[in-house]
């Protein structure tokens, strides 16, 4: 037994403990986040292939038939048996591919029938021998260590025909003879040997499901007999090598064992955990327990499969136990498909490589592990742009790194699978697993590096993951007039103040006649007190929450439909206006200044008064005039107290609603822009001189990054996303008075090619003058960064006009609604705004994340800390005039994603204290930080407000 870093003994057989470890770890716990670190020095980086998958030349130069050659001919509908990457012919091209990657080893398998056509060791096939000698010598010349697999499923057909294949014990000796020859012939150049690749699949699919060669099925006893013979064959070869070759060749030998991974339905259920353990031992344990464990099959199997599972004698147990110099492990798609043949035990299949490595550590006493196969697959139509493969690899590799660095698992090497596209067993040529793309129909079978090859090369070059995404955190503060805000969506006004107390001038006597009623006392009139803002229950609640938040600003939206139910000034809801005035005045008493949004579209009815909605909403240009009238009313009623106005929240997201055709989307956007501009000019001319406020609109502004940094079309798509999503509104307002040239040209080009019939509206000269410059600051709502790829789409929809597709980076910390936490995205966005629209004041008017926690919302705290830190870098390093940060949002809504600092029933979460601290510190001051801002200075608008009160 080995000791781990904590000096605790790991006793074999304790794999089930994996599912009980830290079930309630926070998602932001360092052990759960992507790990930026390096692999151990001299980590063994490799790549692998299987002979049958890549060699081709199936009957060339005297090669014998294999079970897979026969299986293809009889069971699989494959057009050409030689459609592989033809490595037998194009060895030099394989070597160049290996050079490109910079690997330390190449794992390949020897084709038994290429060396010995009928399977028996007589005279080796000279041409086959020459090929493997050339391969080995060429590798050593390049300082690439060969890792050689003796058997990767291509059994000589002669042995299948004559003996029934691995069902027959005769194969044990025949395999040993073949191995002996290989040790004698190649052993001087090979330090790592693998006897058999994934015996589980040979037995299970070869003799159980019939999905693999030789394609036998239905005989359960045969499956376990085959497994038994494979174990004995391996064991015999190990002892042979150990006795006769290791002393002078000084190599290591193992067997590659493959497995899936499984998670319990309920983490706390002992029954489910036992089922998971059973699932693992019946696949991986079937072969690992005899070799790496106690020499026998797992107890679960011996009990359950009594009649079909062969028994080991005590001598055989001793013989098989310990016959591996390291644990060679395969984790890839072949152990996961087809799903219906898996031992799932009703639990959940998972791709968590870190967990399965921990299971091996606990179950088998922390052996040294070589990951002998790892990777995923792409569809056959994918050529060099295998973006999802990058993310699968990134995820797997980081899980390995976490297992090594955080869990003390002794992984010493990693084999990316596969070097080349080739024959993928029961999938034939319908999937690809190569790091290099091969066109099987081309004469020369060129090996073209895929994005995943570039990525793997980079990881090898850096021996891991170096933090390439951040400037070190700063200590520093925001300016003293910085707005620390919280955002709320639409505040629905209370129709009646909740307290009628003192509004009735009469005096009453209760129960004077015993009838338990009130009797008015005639002739007496009392002084009433006027209605007070605190009569509104919701305002009281609001104020309590805001006071706890310690914010300097509160951003909320008015409900247009409540203020003007008819959509015009013929019917003004004075009570609603009074309610909103109360929200503002009461806030100001607490030194909390308002930022008021006039129009906050909601999906249900777009937040429009019903008559406007029915007359076409934003597709009707007259809605802009109605909006002007409504805005004017609000400026008159509230403008003396409100210094920051937002006309429309996220007009660039209305496409979600006006999505019948792209032309609806673009027309609605056009009318919204004009409506905003009309209101800005109205404020500028009539209200600014006396009210001295500022006005803008808030744009949804998520950042975009190319999903695949190695492909130009991806960063072009990311650029296009920014143009279609943000510049669409920002360009007319903050720069040219027209839509972005790039957007206009892209849509026109698609329309010319018949891929769309979209038309971006034109601004008249008057409209251009109206729109250009119609904003006093840049307001943006930023939540996340999207990973973007190019995908050509047809049809006249705004979403398809962009030719953009999104990819979820599985390695990123994400929220329940899959919002990725990528703090540096906000800094890049702010820099983009400055570059494109100049040195103007910028407010982040909403920024936040959904977090499942009802109380201890650690994800939200992490998000706030990291995003505000990036905003500080933008201010201090990039000289961006950031004026405020408004966290989203005050309260969450029932059955909606949990974005709130308070629950829907007003319970406070712990992120409030964290945000308090940020506000009080005005950022991240150093211990002996510079001068703190005094409170009044931090709230310049409020001095005026207090005078007004």
């Amino acid at each position: 037994d080995y000791k781990d870093d904590d000096d605790k003994l790991d006793f074999p057989g304790d794999g089930r403990a994996v599912w009980s470890q830290n079930p309630n770890l926070s998602p932001v716990n360092e052990s759960q986040l992507f790990l930026y670190d390096t692999f151990p020095k001299n980590f063994f980086w490799g790549v692998g292939t299987g002979a049958f998958q890549v060699e081709g030349s199936w009957k060339k130069d005297g090669k014998g038939l294999s079970v897979w050659d026969h299986f293809i001919a009889t069971h699989l509908n494959v057009s050409s048996r030689d459609g592989s990457s033809d490595s037998y012919i194009f060895l030099e091209k394989d070597l160049s591919a290996l050079d490109f990657l910079g690997v330390s080893f190449y794992q390949f398998s020897i084709s038994w029938p290429r060396l010995f056509p009928d399977g028996t060791v007589a005279v080796a096939n000279a041409k086959g021998l020459q090929y493997y000698n050339r391969l080995l010598d060429s590798l050593l010349l390049r300082n690439i260590e060969p890792v050689v697999t003796l058997y990767h499923w291509d059994l000589p057909w002669a042995l299948q025909e004559k003996y029934g294949g691995w069902k027959n014990e005769t194969l044990i000796d025949l395999f040993n003879d073949y191995a002996t020859y290989c040790f004698q012939t190649f052993g001087d150049r090979v330090k790592y040997w693998i006897t058999i690749h994934n015996p589980y699949l040979v037995a299970w699919h070869g003799y159980g499901t019939g999905l693999h060669a030789p394609g036998e099925k239905g005989n359960v006893a045969a499956v376990y007999t085959v497994g038994h013979n494979l174990l004995k064959a391996h064991s015999k070869v190990w002892h042979n090598y150990n006795r006769n070759f290791r002393p002078h060749q000084k190599g290591w030998l193992s067997i590659t064992l493959g497995s899936h991974w499984i998670e319990p339905n309920r983490a706390e259920s002992i029954v489910d955990i036992l089922k998971c353990q059973q699932s693992m031992v019946s696949v991986l344990g079937w072969f690992a327990n005899p070799i790496h464990g106690d020499g026998d099959y797992p107890e679960v199997m011996t009990k359950k499969l009594l009649s079909v599972l062969p028994a080991f004698s005590e001598a055989e147990k001793n013989e098989v136990r310990g016959t591996a110099d390291f644990f060679a492990f395969s984790f890839g798609p072949n152990n996961f498909k087809p799903l219906n043949t898996m031992a799932k035990m009703g639990q959940n299949v998972s791709l968590n490589l870190r967990q399965v490595l921990n299971w091996i550590k606990l179950e088998y006493g922390n052996p040294r592990i070589l990951i002998a196969e790892n990777g995923w697959f792409t569809d056959s139509y994918v050529q060099t742009e295998d973006t999802t493969a990058i993310y699968m690899m990134k995820n797997f590799l980081n899980q390995v790194l976490q297992a090594i660095r955080l869990d003390g698992v002794r992984v010493f090497g990693y084999t990316a699978w596969s070097l080349l596209d080739g024959f993928e067993w029961q999938d034939a040529y319908n999937t690809r697993r190569g790091l290099f793309y091969v066109d099987f129909n081309s004469e020369q079978r060129e090996r073209r590096p895929k994005s995943s090859a570039h990525y793997y090369k980079q990881v090898i070059g850096e021996n891991g993951f170096t933090l390439r995404e951040a400037t070190p955190d700063l200590q520093g503060q925001f300016p003293c007039d910085f707005s620390w805000g919280v955002t709320e969506s639409v505040l629905k006004p209370e129709s009646v103040a909740s307290s009628p107390q003192f509004s009735d001038p009469h005096l009453y006597v209760w129960n004077a006649t015993g009838n338990r009623m009130l009797h008015r006392v005639e002739g007496v009139r009392l002084k009433t007190r006027p209605a007070q803002c605190t009569d509104f229950i919701t305002i009281k609640k609001q104020l309590e929450m805001l006071a706890r938040m310690k914010v300097t600003h509160f951003r909320f939206a008015l409900d247009w439909a409540s203020v003007l139910p008819t959509g015009n000034l013929s019917e003004v809801n004075r009570q609603a206006l009074r309610y909103y005035r109360c929200v503002v005045t009461e806030g100001l008493k607490l030194n909390i200044s308002p930022m008021v949004t006039l129009y906050y579209p909601t999906h249900a009815h777009l937040g429009l008064p019903a008559p406007l909605l029915h007359s076409g909403g934003w597709l009707d240009p007259s809605t802009a005039k109605a909006f002007r009238d409504y805005a004017g009313l609000c400026f008159r009623e509230l403008g003396d107290l409100v210094k920051l106005w937002i006309t429309i929240n996220e007009p660039n997201r209305l496409s979600d609603v006006y999505n019948r055709t792209s032309n609806d989307t673009y027309q609605a956007a056009h009318n919204l822009l004009i409506a905003h501009a009309i209101v800005w000019h109205l404020y500028d001319r009539q209200y600014r001189p006396s009210q001295r406020g500022a006005l803008s609109l808030s744009l949804h502004s998520d950042w975009a990054e190319p999903a695949n940094p190695y492909v130009a079309s991806h960063w072009q798509a990311a650029e296009r996303f920014l143009q279609f999503e943000i510049a669409w509104f920002a360009e007319p307002l903050f720069k040219t008075g027209d839509y972005p040239v790039a957007m206009r040209e892209y849509i026109a080009s698609k329309t010319r090619r018949g891929l769309s019939s979209s038309v971006l509206p034109r601004f008249s000269d008057a409209e251009r003058r109206l729109v250009k410059g119609a904003a006093d600051f840049y307001a943006l709502n930023h939540f996340t960064t999207r990973f973007v790829m190019h995908e050509q789409q047809n049809g006249s929809r705004y979403d398809s006009d962009r030719d953009v597709q999104f990819l979820q980076d599985i390695t990123r910390l994400s929220s329940p609604t899959r919002l990725a936490v990528i703090p540096w995205g906000v800094r890049k966005l702010l820099r983009w705004v400055r570059r494109n629209y100049g040195d103007m004041d910028i407010y982040i008017t909403a920024s936040g994340i959904d977090d499942q926690a009802l109380q201890n919302d650690q994800l939200r705290q992490y998000y706030l800390e990291k995003y505000v830190q990036e905003a500080l870098k933008a201010y201090l390093i990039d000289k961006i005039k950031i004026k405020g940060y408004y966290a989203f949002k005050l309260t969450e809504e029932k059955s909606k994603p949990r974005f709130g600092f308070f629950t829907s029933d007003f319970k406070a979460k712990s992120s409030i204290q964290f945000y308090n601290k940020l506000i009080t510190s005005n950022g991240f001051p150093s211990e002996n930080g510079g001068p703190r801002c005094n409170q009044t200075q931090g709230n310049p608008e409020c001095t005026v407000c207090l005078l007004l009160l």
Epitope: T466, R468, E469, A470, T471, E705, P706, P709, Y710, W715, Q716, A718, E719, L722, F734, K735, T736, V741, A742, W824, K828, W832, V833, R834, R835, N836, Y837, G838, D839
Partner: antibody
Framework: QVQLKQSGPGLVQPSQSLSVACTVS????????VHWVRQSPGKGLEWLGV???????DYNAAFISRLTISKDNSKSQVFFKMNSLQTTDTAIYYC??????????????WGQGTSVTVSS | DIVLTQSPTSLAVSLGQRATISCRAS??????????MTWYQQKPGQPPKLLIY???NLQSGIPARFSGSGSRTDFTLTIDPVEADDVATYYC?????????FGGGTKVEIK
């Protein structure tokens, strides 16, 4: 095709200022930024500063106190002004177009250069 | 400021052979997954010409015999095969951090 044409004096007295205009054609200054780079035998290529499409500027800290870059979008002109020149400022001064993509920070087209000698 | 050191300072190559120019940065010029390294070619009496951006992307109109590679602090420009028209000085430039800086140049001649 994309062009950047520079005009400016060849000779400047020490302690005087240098003004160079760069007139661009076939692209808009509201879409592309314009950089200024100089090249001298002693110091090789030196990046001086940039004016971005939105009008904001970034300067090399070594020149920030004596450099101003401005532009007139409607006239497709960018203006470069450097004060207090010394003999060490003798160089070829280039205006050059930014690649124009958020994800590529590079210069893709250069003016022909203005050869400036600082001498009394 | 980030210092870029090019090597060799001059290079004589036979026609049809490969030329490799190295550029080493005093600190990483990679951030946010982008490699902010650019290569230019300058012929006598002419302004520089863009060859490669983002370390490995070929500018349109530039022949495929030019290629770029590298990450973090070590970058390489390769010309393979070298042609007579490639006689020039080659500069690397980083834009990861202000001020943008250039390497000292590598002069390529034909043997």
């Amino acid at each position: 095709q994309v062009q950047l044409k520079q005009s400016g004096p060849g000779l400047v007295q020490p302690s005087q200022s240098l003004s160079v205009a760069c007139t661009v054609s076939d692209f808009s200054l509201t879409t592309y930024g314009v950089h200024w780079v100089r090249q001298s035998p002693g110091k090789g290529l030196e990046w001086l500063g940039v004016i971005w499409s939105g009008g904001s500027t970034d300067y090399n800290a070594a020149f920030i106190s004596r450099l101003t870059i401005s532009k007139d979008n409607s006239k497709s002109q960018v203006f470069f002004k450097m004060n207090s020149l010394q003999t060490t400022d003798t160089a070829i001064y280039y205006c050059a177009r930014d690649y124009g993509s958020t994800y590529v920070d590079a210069i893709d087209y250069w003016g022909q250069g203005t050869s400036v000698t600082v001498s009394s | 400021d980030i210092v870029l050191t090019q090597s060799p300072t001059s290079l004589a190559v036979s026609l049809g052979q490969r030329a490799t120019i190295s550029c080493r940065a005093s600190e990483s010029v990679e951030s946010y997954g982008n490699r902010y390294m650019t290569w230019y070619q300058q012929k006598p009496g002419q302004p520089p010409k863009l060859l490669i951006y983002r370390a490995a992307n070929l500018q349109s109109g530039i022949p495929a015999r030019f290629s770029g590679s590298g990450s973090r602090t070590d970058f390489t420009l390769t010309i393979d095969p070298v042609e007579a028209d490639d006689v020039a000085t080659y500069y690397c430039q980083q834009s990861n951090e202000d001020p943008w800086t250039f390497g000292g140049g590598t002069k390529v001649e034909i043997k």
